[in-house]
């Protein structure tokens, strides 16, 4: 029988009985929080061999082994992961061994064993056996093996009937508990199961069988399995399903998630049953199953159930995440905030359709509207009283709109109305009438020509650049000297610049009222002599990195015709030299000969220009005497070169510092000193152990249900 | 608190057609999943057809497809079962559920536990 979707036990132990009939758990298994101890010899799961995501156990008490529970389980397949984990054993006070006897293969993820005071034979596993790579495995804060003691069977009484394994340069027993010997199959399988009569199994088969080289006697399958059968790819007009067996056609058109309230179905797509189309598709129509590759971003429908969305915080930007067509209004209503422009534009950037009115009001933080950079139709289908779709009142550092030269913008239905916004020049308002096609619809008073720009240089003349020069690290340019009507009038120059790969950036991007500015400014004062040009060294810039310049004059707000004048530059793009690119990285070589070496390298991470070629020098270096220390054919163990990796269980810090014979002399020496690099290892280390503490925590810790 | 409220039952011959309603209140209609189930005299409650919010996907059970149509109208918070060809074994109590999250990975759409919420049921009779 398969079970799932995941099955949560908690809290009461007799909800293991929901595991009676299980062959197989589609989807994850959590034992945890059952913290009355129980005797749990009564209860026993053989059937269950494989469990397709992960394992979990938390903190359950009076639990000594999991061999009698589960004394059949074979695979753990991870095909999700519990924080990149497919077996974790957190705090399970009274776990004395893991005692898996038969669990042979874990597929995918690494395993987590934190703090078990009470558990051991955790040397005496060797996980390569089970898990591709074990240098994921975290393995920490449980018993210290001194204190375990740990004997595989037979070993007392000097007839060992366990097979050895090398772990970390020790050649030993390997074994779940006293009385179950680690499972190895015989080397001729080479990467095939085998059986408890050490026969290989077919190659489909994972973990064990019980008929040699037979695909339908498989414990648990490689890849798929089908009708009874292992397979390595699913037959025509079948699918594969959460990651481990083929499906027909009719059992995924009916079938729908449970962790959504909508009924969307499940879709087929490269050959698979799955929850949704991938990123970059979308479904065939309505009643489709099937996925076709979406045309730019991919439409996703947002509906606010209020109708009218109201953005006030990042927090409520978030909700937008993603969304290309918001079903409602939008009311825009950022009074302060860090960073807002580009958190906005981070959370609403995608959306290309907004079915009512927009409204954006008191908004100080915001200098510019661009943060909606998809924003190409307002239907106007619901209007605010006025008939307007469009409404900018009071927002004191507006200064754009959109920048017109490469933005089509149409709203559909309604007017436009904006009053109260001093930077925002009113050419920009009527650069908004002629691209959204509203020109006409708007009465005399929808558009304030008094208060829309008045404290604004809405008159602009434009700045040249007359000279730039530069090498790896600098940019020097120069500009035409700015006259305005009254030279008292202009008090200074700033020059904007930062990195622009591309040539698409404008003068608002990221920047918003608060202080936030993807800019760097420097100010420039006016040359004291009237006929040198002003100029500026911008240094400390990466060498062949193109960066986006320019220039505005910092003038009185000198008011002309209810105007102020003002200048800048249009923005100028221009590359630094080229510089030597830094060392290539993870060097590795390798011999696979006695005369060659093979050499293999990543490029450097920062080129400085475009790589040509690469120069490799190579010497002969004298043979090391250290190898010649050691006679090879001894039994002794052969000495092994140990270097620090930084970590240490502090737990089991409880000696004094070894001393140790240090140089030439017969003395001993203090240990060393923590260096830098593990002392911030350390803490990387705790660190990563907090944040899978937390993460366990919000995972499991759930409202009760209604 | 959610309400649903179905009507539309009664007795017809066979060949017959009903049309059901299930209005909703006290949620937002158009972001759930819905469907039908019928429940005959001594029978295991079944699911007849369902429809998501989003894309108006629909689903049938093999004993009504071609004669029964599942269809929404969101403006108005209601479901509709239009029947035809009414037969003397779709006499049951029909019912009329909203989805609600169920946990994780799947179900299948007939499956009562993937549904949240139910009406008390309208009775539909069909016999000449």
């Known amino acids: 029988e398969i079970c799932g979707p995941g099955i949560d036990i908690r809290n009461d132990y007799q909800q293991l009985k929901r595991l009676e009939n299980c062959t197989v758990i589609e989807g994850y298994l959590h034992i945890l929080l059952i913290s009355k101890a129980e005797d749990y010899r009564s209860y026993r799961f053989p059937k269950l061999t494989v469990i397709t995501e992960y394992l979990l156990l938390f903190r359950v008490a009076g639990l000594e082994s999991l061999g009698d529970l589960f004394p059949n389980l074979t695979v753990i397949r991870g095909w999700k992961l519990f924080y990149n984990y497919a077996l974790v054993i957190f705090e399970m006070t009274n776990l004395k061994d893991i005692g898996l006897y038969n669990l042979r293969n874990i597929t995918r993820g690494a395993i987590r064993i934190e703090k078990n005071a009470d558990l051991c034979y955790l040397s005496t596993v060797d996980w390569s056996l089970i898990l591709d790579a074990v240098s994921n495995n975290y393995i920490v804060g449980n018993k210290p093996p001194k204190e375990c003691g740990d004997l595989c069977p037979g070993t007392m009484e000097e007839k060992p009937m366990c097979e050895k394994t090398t772990i970390n340069n020790e050649y030993n027993y390997r074994c779940w508990t006293t009385n179950r010997c680690q499972k190895m199959c015989p080397s001729t399988c080479g990467k095939r199961a085998c059986t408890e009569n050490n026969e290989c199994c077919h190659p489909e088969c994972l973990g064990s069988c019980s008929a040699p080289d037979n695909d339908t006697a498989c414990v648990a399958c490689r890849h798929y399995y089908y009708a009874g059968v292992c397979v390595p790819a699913c037959p025509p007009n079948t699918y594969r399903f959460e990651g481990w067996r083929c499906v027909d056609r009719d059992f995924c058109a009916n079938i729908l998630s449970a962790e959504s309230s909508d009924s969307e179905g499940f879709v087929i797509h490269d050959g698979e049953c799955m929850q949704e189309c991938p990123s970059g598709f979308i479904r065939n129509g309505s009643q489709s199953m099937y996925c076709i590759p979406c045309e730019g971003p991919c439409p996703k429908v947002c509906e606010e159930e209020k109708k009218t969305k109201t953005i006030d915080s990042v927090t409520s930007a978030q909700m937008l995440q993603g969304c290309t067509i918001f079903k409602g209004n939008l009311l825009i209503n950022i009074r302060r905030g860090n960073n807002i422009a580009s958190e906005l534009e981070n959370f609403m950037g995608l959306i290309e359709v907004v079915t009512g009115y927009v409204k954006i009001r008191h908004s100080h933080a915001l200098v510019s509207l661009s943060f909606l950079k998809n924003l190409r139709l307002i239907l106007g289908e619901e209007q605010l009283e006025g008939n307007y779709s469009f409404y900018v009142l009071d927002n004191q550092n507006l200064q754009q709109l959109w920048d017109w030269d490469h933005r089509n913008l149409t709203i559909k239905a309604g007017k436009m109305y904006f009053a109260f916004n001093p930077k925002l020049c009113v050419s920009e308002i009527y650069r908004m009438e002629e691209v959204t096609g509203t020109k006409g619809r708007q009465s005399k008073g929808d558009i304030n020509t008094r208060n829309n720009g008045e404290r604004a240089s809405c008159e602009s003349d434009v700045l040249h650049f007359t000279s730039t020069t530069t090498s790896k690290n600098r940019i020097i340019i120069t500009w035409h000297r700015y006259r305005p009507p009254d030279y008292r009038d202009l008090i200074s120059f700033t020059v904007y610049y930062k990195e622009a790969p591309f040539k698409n950036v404008t003068e608002y991007d990221g920047q918003d009222a608060c202080g936030s500015n993807s800019w760097n400014m420097v100010d420039v004062d006016l040359p004291p002599n009237k006929d040198v040009e002003p100029g500026i060294l911008l240094h400390g810039l990466k060498p062949w990195t193109q960066y986006a310049v320019y220039v505005k004059a910092v003038t009185l707000t000198m008011v002309e015709n209810d105007h102020i004048r003002g200048a800048k530059s249009e923005i100028l793009y221009i590359r630094t030299n080229a510089s030597v690119p830094s060392i290539p990285l993870d060097v590795l070589s390798a011999s696979n000969s006695s005369s060659q070496l093979i050499v293999k390298w990543n490029p450097p991470s920062l080129p400085n220009g475009n790589l040509s070629y690469y120069i490799v020098r190579w010497q002969r270096q004298p043979q090391d005497g250290y190898l010649y220390r050691h006679n090879y054919c001894s039994k002794d163990k052969i000495p092994i070169r140990k270097y620090a990796d930084g970590t240490i269980d502090i737990e089991e810090v409880t000696e004094n510092p070894k001393t140790e014979v240090c140089g030439g002399e017969k003395g001993p020496c203090c240990a060393c000193p923590k260096t830098e690099a593990e002392k911030q290892a350390e803490k990387e280390e705790a660190e990563y152990r907090k944040v899978f503490e937390n993460f366990l925590h919000n995972s499991i810790f759930v409202p009760r249900p209604e | 608190e959610v309400q649903l409220v179905e009507s539309g039952g009664g007795l017809v011959q066979p060949g017959g057609s009903l049309r059901l309603s299930c209005t909703a209140s006290?949620?937002?209609?158009?972001?759930?999943?819905m469907a039908w189930f019928r429940q005959a005299p001594g029978k295991e409650r079944e699911g007849v057809s369902a429809i998501s919010a989003s894309s108006g996907r629909t689903y049938y059970a093999d004993s009504v497809k071609g004669r029964f149509t599942i269809s929404r109208d969101n403006a108005k918070n209601t479901l509709y079962l239009q029947m035809n060809s009414l037969r003397a074994e779709d006499t049951a109590v029909y019912y009329c559920?909203?989805?609600?999250?169920?946990?994780?990975?799947?179900?299948?759409?007939?499956?009562?536990?993937?549904?949240?919420?139910w009406g008390q049921g309208t009775l539909v009779t069909v016999s000449s």
């Open positions: 559920a909203v989805r609600s999250k169920n946990g994780a990975g799947y179900g299948f759409w007939y499956e009562a536990r993937l549904y949240g919420y």
């Open positions: 006290g949620l937002t209609f158009g972001t759930f999943g």
